[in-house]
Amino acid sequence: GSQHIRAEKAMVDGSWLDLAKRSKLEAQPFAHLTINATDIPSGSHKVSLSSWYHDRGWAKISNMTFSNGKLIVNQDGFYYLYANICFRHHETSGDLATEYLQLMVYVTKTSIKIPSSHTLMKGGSTKYWSGNSEFHFYSINVGGFFKLRSGEEISIEVSNPSLLDPDQDATYFGAFKVRDID
């Protein structure tokens, strides 16, 4: 009889453990933000991209905040940050201002408490995109593991924003918490 009770108790404890694990997982912060194609800046200079979707298509956010073009951390922790930026040009959409391009992405962390800004990751290349080629494409993917504090903000800067590929599977960035800070 006592064995049976112990087994039942273990099962109940186990299910509570699962539930606790699951609720903790559900509370784990994550975000996947996709470019808002209706509001991409023009030009060739380095700009901050402020228009991102957080709740449509592939875009989702949980226990993080998106505000004023920045992804805001709500929980201290170690996070994996990633960004994928695609640049493209087809001759039917116009001419290139220059055939020599620097196509770059910068993932930046801004701290409000101690006003400071740091580039966490950058990627890209200089490219020769001949005006005689009908189509050009280039993709950058960066990712890394960072300690982030509540209130810190993540933003994306790119060069040549007018060449951004506006598809949700092309230009996006995100973050997910991997573990707590000990």
Partner: antibody, heavy 118, light 111 residues
């Protein structure tokens, strides 16, 4: 539809300068090179140079490099071509033009006749 | 600079017959698998109008009587059959490299 409207005919003295205008409409002015081509009875069609209106990048053919300045005003979608130190051989019809969505010059202004005469 | 030589300088063709105009470039105008040669028609007092782009592509609204062919340095504009309205001067142009250049023109007269 794409339209390029040029300024009126000019009669100028040798040694003087002329500044022609070309107002673009029907497309995003800052996304295409705007070209200048002239046509003289003796030389036929000659490509002079071009401007990319956004950043203002320019390119000129060697023959005109020292005498031509191409500019653009993005607020009015207007391009300008100034030709200095005019001589009689510069008497010509001057066209502004833009390529088509593929290639080739699909859009032309109506042309501006410049006559250089004392 | 790439020099474009058109021939003949003028030709007279009977109504309904074929007109052939040649354009030879001093060096290849091909790159990225395409030929950067275009053909224009110009009537007196008018700007040129684009007929053929990238050697063989018919510009929108241009009658199928007009066709272009060729690659690298040798290109041809063909009008078949010729109509009375085709009396004009025809120019080839390359934009493979700066400065863009034009041929000297071919004046077509209809007999």
């Amino acid at each position: 539809q794409v339209q390029l409207v040029q300024s009126g005919a000019e009669l100028v003295q040798p040694g003087a300068s002329v500044k022609l205008s070309c107002k673009a409409s029907g497309y995003t002015f800052t996304t295409y090179w705007l070209q200048w081509v002239r046509q003289t009875p003796g030389q036929g069609l000659e490509w002079m140079g071009a401007i990319y209106p956004g950043p203002g990048n320019t390119k000129y053919t060697q023959k005109f490099k020292d005498r031509v300045t191409i500019t653009a005003d993005t607020s009015t979608s207007t391009a300008y071509m100034q030709l200095n130190s005019l001589r009689s051989e510069d008497s010509a019809v001057y066209y502004c033009a833009r390529r088509g969505s593929r290639r080739g010059i699909a859009y032309w202004g109506q042309g501006t006749l410049v006559t250089v005469s004392a | 600079n790439i020099v474009l030589t058109q021939s003949p300088a003028s030709l007279a063709v009977s109504l309904g017959q074929r007109a052939t105009i040649s354009c030879r470039a001093s060096e290849s105008v091909d790159s990225y698998g395409r030929s950067f040669m275009h053909w224009y028609q110009q009537r007196p007092g008018q700007p040129p109008t684009l007929l053929i782009y990238l050697a063989s592509n018919l510009e929108s609204g241009v009658p199928v009587r007009f066709s272009g062919s060729g690659s690298r340095t040798d290109f041809t504009l063909t009008i078949d059959p010729v109509e009375a309205d085709d009396a004009a001067t025809y120019y080839c142009q390359q934009d493979n490299e700066d400065p863009y250049t034009f041929g000297g023109g071919t004046k077509l007269e209809i007999k």
